[in-house]
């Protein structure tokens, strides 16, 4: 079963810009990636980017750029005003959902200030059985 990882990286020189990196370890066919956050602006989950292997990427503010970093990992860059960034991000959790075959959906989340290595145990949101 694939393991999903998430890391959030603040830019050292620009406190209003940071990146969410996430990927899947192991052998699986990725059909869709959704990057979202919780606790930012309101209590609900905010979709930041959707990345499709063939049809490209789509992102929503405050996401500035979303792209594939490798065949099994993505990166989303976010930009916002510095004062807003400091106040909003303290309680924000970033989540990445990888829809893979044949393992189904795998989600991992982490917050901006967590200091562990960044490997999160995958939580199956949906299990699809292979034929």
């Amino acid at each position: 079963s694939p393991e999903v990882w998430v890391q959030v990286q603040m830019e050292a020189t620009n406190l209003s810009s940071f990146s969410v990196h996430c990927g899947v370890l192991g052998y699986s066919l990725i059909s869709l990636v959704t990057v979202s956050c919780e606790g930012f602006v309101d209590a609900g989950r905010t979709k930041l980017a959707v990345l499709h292997p063939e049809f490209g990427t789509q992102q929503w503010a405050p996401a500035r750029q979303a792209h594939w970093e490798t065949p099994n990992s993505v990166s989303v860059t976010l930009t916002m005003g510095q004062s807003k960034a400091r106040s909003s991000l303290a309680n924000t959790t970033f989540c990445c959902e990888f829809v893979t075959f044949p393992h189904g959906s795998r989600v991992a989340c982490r917050d901006l200030h967590r200091s562990d290595p960044g490997l999160s145990a995958p939580t199956p949101a949906l299990n699809l059985q292979a034929d």
Epitope: Q7, S19, L25, L29, F55, G56, W68, T70, S73
Partner: antibody, heavy 123, light 106 residues
Framework: QVQLVQSGAEVKKPGSSVKVSCKAS????????ISWVRQAPGQGLEWMGG????????NYAQKFQGRVTITADESTSTAYMELSSLRSEDTAVYYC????????????????WGQGTLVTVSS | DIQMTQSPSSLSASVGDRVTITCRAS??????LNWYQQKPGKAPKLLIY???SLQSGVPSRFSGSGSGTDFTLTISSLQPEDFATYYC????????FGGGTKVEIK
């Protein structure tokens, strides 16, 4: 124009480890993954694994899982591949290569490549 | 793992010949297929990416086609510098290379 320069040839004893370096120059290092590929004498190419220097997460081919460790030092723009428990079958040229892609789709390829490092395992 | 099978494993041809190398994937890989050329003692060189896109600086006599499981590399008119070994590579699930095709002088 990015260039990848690898460390020199190594001769190792069976059971030992080897660590090969790959230094990038002439471009951004952190945002591009570096893969390691090996080629035994007279044989084909074999992908071992790769790493995204930022955030430093590596992915490995199942065959090498547990025996290979790929790391990267962003401050020196250098990637490393360490292979442990060496045996004679590990005698090969080891290449590093940059995973290059369009970004907006999942298409990736290897370009450029390092010059290769010959690792000889012999008692 | 996805297996990549190249054929033929070797071929003999003359300058000016049209050469075709095929690569078959053990499962559908869409167009996640690259082609490389390697000469003895040298690192591989990218020729074609995403099944049919010609890498910058590569002569137009090289072309790639195919999708799904079957792919082809064609050299329209073989030149002396084209005698080398050619590898296909899938990038759909991690990376796997084909076994290689050695193009030799007839």
């Amino acid at each position: 124009q990015v260039q990848l320069v690898q460390s020199g040839a190594e001769v190792k004893k069976p059971g030992s480890s080897v660590k090969v370096s790959c230094k990038a120059s002439g471009g951004t290092f952190g945002n591009y993954a570096i893969s390691w590929v090996r080629q035994a004498p007279g044989q084909g190419l074999e992908w071992m694994g790769g790493i995204i220097p930022i955030p430093g997460i590596a992915n490995y081919a199942q065959k090498f899982q547990g025996r290979v460790t790929i790391t990267a030092d962003e401050s020196t723009s250098t990637a490393y591949m360490e292979l442990s428990s060496l045996r004679s079958e590990d005698t090969a040229v080891y290449y590093c290569a940059r995973d290059t892609g369009r970004g907006y789709t999942r298409h990736f390829w290897f370009d450029p490549w390092g010059q290769g490092t010959l690792v000889t395992v012999s008692s | 793992d996805i297996q990549m099978t190249q054929s033929p494993s070797s071929l003999s041809a003359s300058v000016g010949d049209r050469v075709t190398i095929t690569c078959r994937a053990s499962q559908s890989i869409s167009s996640y297929l690259n082609w490389y050329q390697q000469k003895p003692g040298k690192a591989p060189k990218l020729l074609i990416y995403a099944a049919s896109s010609l890498q910058s600086g590569v002569p137009s006599r090289f072309s790639g086609s195919g999708s799904g499981t079957d792919f082809t590399l064609t050299i329209s008119s073989l030149q002396p510098e084209d005698f080398a070994t050619y590898y296909c590579q899938q990038s759909d699930i991690l990376y796997t290379f084909g076994g290689g095709t050695k193009v030799e002088i007839k």
